[in-house]
Structure formats: C-alpha cells, structure tokens
C-alpha cells in the first residue's frame, strides 16, 4: 500500500531548488528494496521535469517556481518496482495543488469607461458600471476579492463627491444633487480596483461621465424690445429679427425656439424660427391697412419645441411695428357696375356715372378716369367726373363685341400720388333689344333635283330677341308663286318648306321671299335656287350648262 500525504506547493517559491515536497513510501519496502518513479504532467510530459523523485528514498521534489495562474493542479502517477524491475504496487495518482499567492493585481476590462446621466438626476440614479478582473484565486483566498473606489473627480464641482461607486459591484451612481450640463457637461473619475478586499494590489481606470441635457433652461430674449416697419398691403414681408439665447444643448428640441404672438387675434403676423441660429423672423401674414391702424405693439413669447422639464418663466419681448402709408389705387364702387341701356340709345348721351373712391384718406388726391377697354369704340368718359356717354350707335346684335346681350368695358381711375396708382372697374352694359333686324332665310342657296325633287326646309332667322322674332310670316313675291310653293314647317313658323310646282329645267333660278317678324318688320330676300340633273335629294349637284336666258322665274 502507498503512503502519500496531501501535497500542496505555494507558487512563486524562492528556492533553492530542487526543494523537497513529500516522501512517498510503499509499505512493500519491508519485503525488499523498492525503487520509485513518477510519470505524468510535470514529470515526463510537458512541462517535463518540474517534479522529480529520488529513486531510492521516494522524496518528491519541485525543481522550479510554480505559477498557479498557469497550472493550478498537477496530476502525477507514482510507481514502485523491486530490484528486478517488477512492479510491487499499482500506480497511484498524486494530486499536487499549487497554492495561490497575491501575485496578480486587478485589471480593468477597459482603460476608459463611458457613461451618461441626465442633468438634475437625484441621488440614487445609476450612471454606469466599471469592471475589473483578477487572475488570482477567488475561491480560497481574498487575493482576487476586488473592492472599487473613486480616487478623484474632475471637476470637483459643484461638490467633490458627485458620484459614488458600489465597492462590491463597481456600479457608479449619483450621490450628490446639482448635476448641471450647462455648468459641467462632463466628469472624469479615476476609479481604483484593489484586491484583498481593497487592501491589496490595485490598478486604476478612467470613467468619463457625460451629463446629458434636459430642457431646464428657457430661451431668453436679448434684447426684449424691438422696432420694425412695414409697408401697408404687403404679406410675407420681414419686419424684424428677434434674438434669443438658450443655454441648453444647441440644435436639440430643448434649444430650438418656438415663438408665439400673444396679442394677434387677427392673425396678421407670423414668427418663424431660423433653424440655424434660432432667431425669430417676424413677418406679415397678410397685408396691413395703414388707414385702419398705423401701429401695432406685439407681445411675443418664446418656448422650446419640447416642454420645460422644470418650472421656468417664459421670456417675452415687445415689438413695435409701424405701418407705412403706401399710395393705393382708387377703388371703383362697385368693382363691377351693371347698367341696362337700349341698343338704340342716343349717340352722345350720358349712360351712367362710374366713379372710384380714394383709399388714401390721409392724402388729398385727384382721380382721373379713362376708358381702358372698349372693343367696339362705342363709349367715352369724362376724365374728371367719370360720366360715361355714347360716341357711336350701340348694337346688341354685334355678336363679335356683345355676348349674351352684354357689352363689357374696362374703366381705369388714376390718382396723382407718387408713384401713380391705377384702379380698374368693369362696366357691364346690358343692351335691351330693339326690333332693328328683319327675318332672313337660312340657307339662301338651295338645290333641287330635276326629277322627283325633294322639298327643301328653309329656316327663318332673326337676330333680335322675342317678341321681335317669331312667329314669322313668309310670302313669295314678284311672281315666284307661279312655279314655287311654300308652307310652314312648324307651329312657331320658324321654318318653311319650299318645293317646285312642276318639273323644271336644269338651271339657276332666283326666288323673291318676303319674311316678316311678329312686330311686322319685313324684308324681301332673293333665294338662289339651282335645279340639277339628278333625282330625289340633291346631294351632289351635277348642273348642266347654265341657262343664259337670264333671270328665270
């Protein structure tokens, strides 16, 4: 049987080497000489030769300093043989435990740790965690029992201990109130990790803490009073630029200004924010009227895109806006004037007076009138009074210039301001009808076939309006009824049917047709009739040589 006491060997032993560890014995040595050997890691396998055994005495020895952090346990096998080389014992496993020395200092996992915390955070707020490791034995010794401490804080403001560290976990948290990004945006802590529960080997690292922004500073007007002026009637005109400062982080919602006009019920002004420099740009939202109000005193408040995190006073500014008088165009009243007038209105007579009002009540100005558009050249205007009269006969049936019985003229009024301003009015002459047009046939040129001619419909047209139109009366004159007949085509007598009484020779004929309207205004019209060499309906008329007998009836 083997006699092997427990074996442990401290790491980093000084020497001299080899050094005795234990004496191995087999109780078979009572029966005869026993020779000892060892095999295994550290003996005959790498690292070879760390352990040796005296062949005859069984003294197990170590030949060099050990490093627990490299190999913490060696497993060897002891062998015993007699002088003839036969084994006297089964091989026995030997465990050599390397005991720890505090030969490794803690090492932080990073040289620089980064964390952040919101400004104004209360004590208790977690910021970040730092971590260190130690290669020494943390099971049987305190050689790897790390304790964390903060060695320094830069800046030491507003208090030298703004943060604390959990000595066991390395978690850094806020311990003092008063974190203010606008005063101290970053803190640099030197943190220490020390083994032996803080009493042993130590190392340091840096923790950089960024204080993040909250909206704890209001935008503030500087200056708080402004003056500006703007011409009347102009929208989207820049009046002045409002300046603010905000101590919060630039180009964030806590910094970006939002302007509100507190006393602009009419919505006549607007303030937009310049995204680059946060200025407020005050502009007109609509045209202002100098004659109504010459000065506005605006109160403008400024806040941020996001609400204030804390109770803050809203900054306000006063803007005095002077409205500048601009020469405004005369205004026709009404802007569109309708006048009913008979189309036979006498030339040179006054139809109406169409005048404009001068908006510039603070300026004494003279208005001059001119006709700007009078396409038929029917009108003239008194330049001083705006009285409009006819210079030529009106004609309701002048369909080039008259639409739906309405003749449109444009009148302009010009003041003598500087610069000159011109206003426009529209004159609508509603022309009432006079029975000045007799009925006429349509068409006036008619084709018949020589054989089996088809009767032709002739429409009766009158440019006038009822009652100066249908029902019409039609009558063939100058002997035309000898060869031709007419009859009314419809009850309103707005068309007639013309047909020959007998077979006619191919050729051209002229027929006199008298037409009379409902008011007995009549007119004789000559119809041009061609008889063609065809049968039925005269579509394409192939006429024979014209009859040279002259007028054929």
């Amino acid at each position: 049987d083997w006699v092997i006491p427990p074996i442990s060997c401290p790491e980093n032993e000084k020497g001299p080497f080899p050094k005795n560890l234990v004496q191995i014995k087999s109780n078979k040595d009572k029966e005869g000489k026993v020779f000892y050997s060892i095999t295994g890691q550290g003996a005959d396998t790498p690292p070879v030769g760390v352990f040796i055994i005296e062949r005859e005495t069984g003294w197990l020895k170590v030949t060099e300093p050990l490093d627990r952090e490299r190999i913490a346990t060696y497993t060897l096998f002891s062998h015993a043989v007699s002088s003839n080389g036969n084994a006297v014992e089964d091989p026995m496993e030997i465990l050599i435990t390397v005991t720890d020395q505090n030969d490794n200092k803690p090492e932080f996992t990073q040289e620089v740790f980064k964390g952040s915390v919101m400004e104004g955070a209360l004590p208790g707020t977690s910021v970040m965690e730092v971590t260190a490791t130690d290669a020494d034995d943390d099971v049987n010794t305190y050689n790897a029992a790390i304790a964390y401490t903060i060695l320094s804080q830069d800046p030491e403001l507003p208090d030298k201990n703004m943060f604390t560290i959990n000595r066991n976990t390395g978690v850094i948290s806020v311990v003092t109130t008063g974190l203010d990004r606008e005063s101290f945006p970053t803190y640099t802590l030197v943190v220490q990790a020390a083994d032996l529960q803080g009493e042993g080997l130590s190392t340091t690292a840096t923790a950089v803490i960024t204080v993040t922004d909250t909206n704890d500073n209001p935008p503030i007007f500087n200056p708080t009073t402004y003056k500006g002026q703007v011409p009347e009637n102009e929208a989207n005109v820049v009046i002045t630029t409002l300046k603010v400062t905000d101590a919060d982080a630039p180009n964030t919602p806590a910094w970006e200004a939002v302007y509100t006009i507190l006393n602009d019920d009419g919505g006549q002004f607007v303030v937009t924010t310049n995204p680059v420099n946060n200025d407020g740009i005050l502009k007109t939202a609509k045209g202002l009227d100098f004659e109504a109000k010459q000065q506005y005193i605006l109160h403008v408040a400024v806040t941020n895109v996001v609400p204030f995190e804390v109770s803050l006073t809203t900054s306000t500014a006063t803007v005095t806006v002077d409205v500048l008088d601009v020469n405004e165009a005369p205004i026709f009243v009404p802007p569109e004037k309708r006048v009913e007038v008979s189309e036979d209105f006498g030339v040179g007579q006054e139809i109406t007076s169409y005048t404009a009002q001068e908006p510039d009540t603070f300026m004494e100005q003279k208005i001059t009138y001119r006709i700007w558009r009078d396409t038929a050249n029917w009108l003239e205007i008194n330049p001083d009074t705006g009285a409009i009269s006819t210079r030529a006969e009106l004609d309701r049936e002048d369909f080039e210039h008259v639409k739906n019985s309405t003749y449109t003229a444009l009148i302009i009024a010009t003041d003598n301001g500087s610069p000159v301003a011109t206003g426009t009015g529209t004159l609508l002459l509603i022309l009432s009808d006079v029975n000045d047009n007799a009925p006429i046939p349509e068409p006036r040129t008619i084709f018949f076939c020589e054989r089996n001619p088809k009767p032709q419909v002739i429409n009766i047209i009158d440019a006038d309006l009822p009652p100066n139109t249908s029902p019409f009366t039609a009558e063939l004159t100058h002997g035309a009824s000898a060869n031709w007949t007419i009859q009314y085509n419809d009850p309103t007598q707005e068309s007639i049917i013309l047909k020959p009484k007998m077979a006619l020779e191919v050729g051209d004929y002229k027929i006199n047709l008298k037409l009379m309207d409902n008011q007995n205004k009549d007119q004789v019209t000559t119809l041009e009739v061609s008889v063609c060499d065809c049968e039925g309906a005269a579509g394409v008329c192939r006429k024979a040589q014209p009859v040279e007998a002259g007028l054929q009836i």
Epitope: G120, A121, T125, S173, V175, D216, V310
Partner: antibody
Framework: EVQLLESGGGLVQPGGSLRLSCAAS????????MSWVRQAPGKGLEWVSA????????YYADSVKGRFAISRDNSKNTLYLQMNSLRAEDTAVYYC??????????WGQGTMVTVSS | QSALTQPASVSGSPGQSITISCTGT?????????VSWYQQHPGKAPKLILS???KRPSGVSNRFSGSKSGNTASLSISGLQAEDEADYYC???????????FGGGTKLTVL
C-alpha cells in the same frame, strides 16, 4: 439662519386630500434636493418622497406611489406635497428635509396629518 | 420592518460609553461609505449628528463617533450625559429610487 417651515397639516377623512407646504430660507433652495419624511405616532422615520433641485426628477416610496405628488417652486423657495386618497396609515408627522449629498440636513419642525373618520 | 436593523434600545450610566449598531447588506451599508446618524428628542425634529460614517457636522460634540465594518455601521457615544437620552436613527445610501434607507431607530436611556 437656515430654516424650513412646514404647513398645511390637519384632520382629513379617509379618501380625502391635503396639500403640505414647506417654506425655505437661509440657503440656496434650488441647489438642494428636497424630501418629505414622515413619522407615525410612536414609530420610526419613513422616507416618503424626494425631488431634485430643478424639479425635473422625483422619487416616491412604494407606499405612496400614485397617490402623492411632490413639487417645488424655486421662485418662491417652497416645497409641496399633494396627498390624495389618504388612508389611516398615512397619519404621521410630516417633515421636510433638504439634502445636497445623501444625508438630510436641514429639517423642518414637522406638521401633523391625521386621517380619521 | 425597516431596511436597516438597529437594536430597539440601549442604556448606559452617565460617563459610560455605549455603541449602537446598524446592520444592512452588501448593497447599502457594505457598499458605500454613506451612513448617517440622526438624533431625535421627543417631540422634536431629527438632527444630523454624523455623516459619511464618521464625519461630524459643526456644533456636534466629539463624544459622538462612527465606524463601519463590512455590512454593519456603529455609532459610539462616550462620556454619556443626560441630554444624550433620545432616539437614534441610522440611514444608508443605496442605489435606486429609494436612495435612502432608514433604520428602525434605537431608544437610548441614560440611567
């Protein structure tokens, strides 16, 4: 002289509301986190709520969360505690206390809140 | 049940010394050097007598001292006087929204 003066305590029925005030003087109020600490009759001290110097951060004990609201007005150097849905177990002397680092100093003299029907 | 454990009462004769313990965990007393002690006389507001384990505010007698070992902090009062009879409370910083833990209080009787 550093001073904190509580007011607003009194008798209130269960389910009722009360608003406590704490007027500060003699120190830079906005530089201090402020807390309310209460003490039930014959019992120990219990932390109730805290608010940062700017008023941007607040904490509450689990026993009052959702019922009490802490606030401050730095322009008036005043701390408030709005207490709603009051219960019999909220009966206590309520102290306001200031803190720069994690200790309470100064303290007010306290105001008694009694919740009883 | 308070977060920090204190003896309910201690007593001592005038001139003697006494110690009041305050036991927490490795997340509060054991983790930070932010243990404070308060003295409260009957009907009065608490008064800070020690901060950061052993720092005395101005005006506090040097008979009061503090120490910490592991998860336990201690308040020692030497040369007991009649006016020391009061309730004593410890507090410890802990990370989180309940940043201050209170002990249950210890009644000191001067015999």
């Amino acid at each position: 002289e550093v001073q904190l003066l509580e007011s607003g305590g009194g008798l209130v029925q269960p389910g009722g509301s009360l608003r406590l005030s704490c007027a500060a003087s003699g120190f830079t109020f906005s530089s201090y986190a402020m807390s309310w600490v209460r003490q039930a009759p014959g019992k120990g001290l219990e932390w109730v709520s805290a608010i940062s110097g700017s008023g941007g951060s607040t904490y509450y004990a689990d026993s009052v969360k959702g019922r009490f609201a802490i606030s401050r007005d730095n322009s008036k150097n005043t701390l408030y505690l709005q207490m709603n849905s009051l219960r019999a177990e909220d009966t206590a002397v309520y102290y306001c206390a200031g803190s720069r680092t994690v200790q309470f100093d100064p303290w007010g003299q306290g105001t008694m809140v009694t919740v009883s029907s | 049940q308070s977060a920090l454990t204190q003896p309910a009462s201690v007593s001592g004769s005038p001139g003697q010394s006494i110690t009041i313990s305050c036991t927490g965990t490795s997340n509060d007393v054991g983790a930070y050097n932010y243990v404070s002690w308060y003295q409260q006389h009957p009907g009065k507001a608490p008064k800070l007598i020690l901060s950061e384990v052993n720092k005395r505010p101005s005006g506090v007698s040097n008979r009061f001292s503090g120490s910490k070992s592991g998860n336990t902090a201690s308040l020692s009062i030497s040369g007991l006087q009649a006016e020391d009879e009061a309730d004593y409370y410890c507090t410890s910083y802990t990370m989180g929204s309940t940043f201050m833990l209170f002990g249950g209080g210890t009644k000191l009787t001067v015999l």
